[in-house]
């Protein structure tokens, strides 16, 4: 029960996280104009990974896409790449984890397969979260560097009369969305990995004790153990002790057409 809850919660947390990563990647407010020197500006600038926008005090907003690929800073390209990798890995992780959920039955998929899928999706979520956090952090670092550089040469006098003021940018809402979303995806991934341990079959192999009676060889099975012919260990490494209770999955022990999706 706890395993199912942990897995389900991990899935939900990761889902929210990945939705947040997608939202952050699409948002225009990665960096916003610093209003420290002029809190009542007639024009407010903000920039995203894909376009830059300006909102006039009238409410009129105009955005322009970065229609160049080669002309963009390498750091911005790197941030884009990290965010996209994070989204792709997260999306694949979500797809895998749906099939791995203990509460969803697909044919007679064994617990070992579900455990492997849970672990795979968990790792994918962790990497996805790390990609998002890394992407946002790289962008934040870039902003901090540029902020202090533009502060250093804030006013470059032209003939002592004219001021050309560089627009300084500070952290936008998307950065915080990205950090939180990346963190959630990471936490979700860790939860999936923890759930995987609970789902994974125990390594204990139960060997039947056999008694040789006159006539044909029969393996003696104490209550709760499945009957097995011969002496060999359970080669499928399947936990065959179930305390007397049997699930529907255990009854159907041979592959069926539903096993291969």
């Amino acid at each position: 029960m706890a395993v199912t809850a942990c897995q389900g919660l991990g899935f939900v947390v990761s889902l929210i996280g990945i939705a947040g990563i997608i939202a952050a990647t699409c948002m225009d407010q990665w960096s916003t104009q610093d209003l420290y020197n002029n809190p009542v500006t007639a024009v407010f600038n903000y920039q995203g990974l894909w376009r830059s926008c300006v909102r006039e005090s009238s409410g009129f907003t105009e955005c322009r896409g970065y229609f160049t690929l080669l002309g963009l800073p390498a750091m911005l390209q790197a941030v884009r790449a990290l965010m996209i990798v994070g989204i792709v890995l997260g999306a694949i992780g979500l797809l895998v984890s749906i099939f791995a959920l203990k509460c969803i039955r697909i044919g007679s998929m064994e617990d070992s397969a579900k455990a492997n899928m849970t672990l795979t999706s968990g790792i994918m979520f962790i990497v996805s979260g790390l990609c998002a956090i890394a992407g946002v952090s790289v962008f934040a670092n870039m902003l901090v560097t540029n902020f202090w550089m533009s502060t250093a040469n804030m006013y470059t006098g032209m003939g002592g009369m004219v001021q050309t003021v560089q627009t300084r940018y500070t952290f936008g809402a998307a950065l915080f969305v990205g950090w939180v979303a990346g963190g959630l995806t990471l936490i979700g991934g860790v939860m999936m990995c923890i759930a995987c341990r609970g789902l994974a079959p125990e390594e204990t192999n139960y060997k039947a004790v056999s008694y040789h009676a006159s006539g044909h060889s029969v393996a003696y099975k104490p209550g709760g153990f499945k009957a097995s012919t011969g002496f060999g260990s359970n080669t499928k490494n399947k936990k065959i002790y179930d305390g007397g209770a049997r699930t529907e999955d255990e009854v159907q022990s041979y592959p069926s057409k539903h096993d291969y999706v």
Partner: antibody, heavy 119, light 112 residues
């Protein structure tokens, strides 16, 4: 037909108050920003204040303490309350429309109302 | 506040001749998004101002194509290719990058 008609101007003594009105027709104040701009006799233009379609307000900091901009959406009318008037406030006061959906600034102006501050 | 300086203060022109009015701002009006927040207004005698050019170079609707605006971040020019009698009045430049919006002192265009 877009029209802005200012009223309420006249001769007023220093230290007294006056309220100017700007009746808008042909458009709704809830969709446009409206500015007050003044022009002293024989002088240039000076921006006073603006009220935006969403109710946000900006003032010229030099006049903020004495002037208050407001509007009545039901009457589609803009107001400028002027307190503690001084001789230097003598000017023609214009109201001007500012679209919220385009890059234009003040695109339509009223004919103005003259305020004379004199003892 | 951003200071707008216009020159000349008076400009006598012969009809049919070109005219040029200059405006300089104390701070660059070129925003990081590429827009320049400089506007030109004409106030004809006894009338209220009318918008001629917005964002430095874009003519407002109904403005004859003989009017054009150009400039850099701090130096701007309003050109009239062929002056007509109806163009007389005072021309103002205005910045709307920062509050308060500020106007130039005006250039009075007269017919010779």
């Amino acid at each position: 037909q877009v029209q802005l008609v200012e009223s309420g101007g006249g001769v007023v003594q220093p230290g007294r108050s006056l309220r100017l009105s700007c009746a808008a027709s042909g458009f709704s104040l809830t969709n446009y920003g409206v500015h007050w701009v003044r022009q002293a006799p024989g002088k240039g233009l000076e921006w006073v204040a603006v009220i935006w379609s969403d109710g946000r307000i900006n003032y010229n900091s030099a006049l903020k303490s004495r002037f208050t901009i407001s509007r009545d959406n039901s009457k589609n009318t803009l107001y400028l309350q002027m307190n503690s008037l001084r001789a230097e406030d003598t000017a023609v006061y214009y109201c001007a429309r500012h679209p919220a959906f385009g890059p234009h600034a003040m695109d339509y102006w009223g004919q103005g109302t003259l305020v004379t501050v004199s003892s | 506040d951003i200071v707008m300086t216009q020159s000349p203060l008076s400009l006598p022109v012969t009809p049919g001749e070109p005219a040029s009015i200059s405006c300089r701002s104390s701070k660059s009006l070129l925003n990081s998004n590429g827009n320049t927040y400089l506007y030109w207004y004409l106030q004809k005698p006894g009338q209220s101002p009318q918008l001629l050019i917005y964002r430095m170079s874009n003519p407002a609707s109904g403005v004859p194509d003989r009017f054009s605006g150009s400039g850099s971040g701090t130096d701007f020019t309003l050109k009239i290719s062929r002056v007509e009698a109806e163009d007389v009045g005072v021309y103002y430049c205005m910045q709307y990058l920062e509050y308060p919006p500020t106007f130039g002192a005006g250039t009075k265009l007269e017919i010779k």
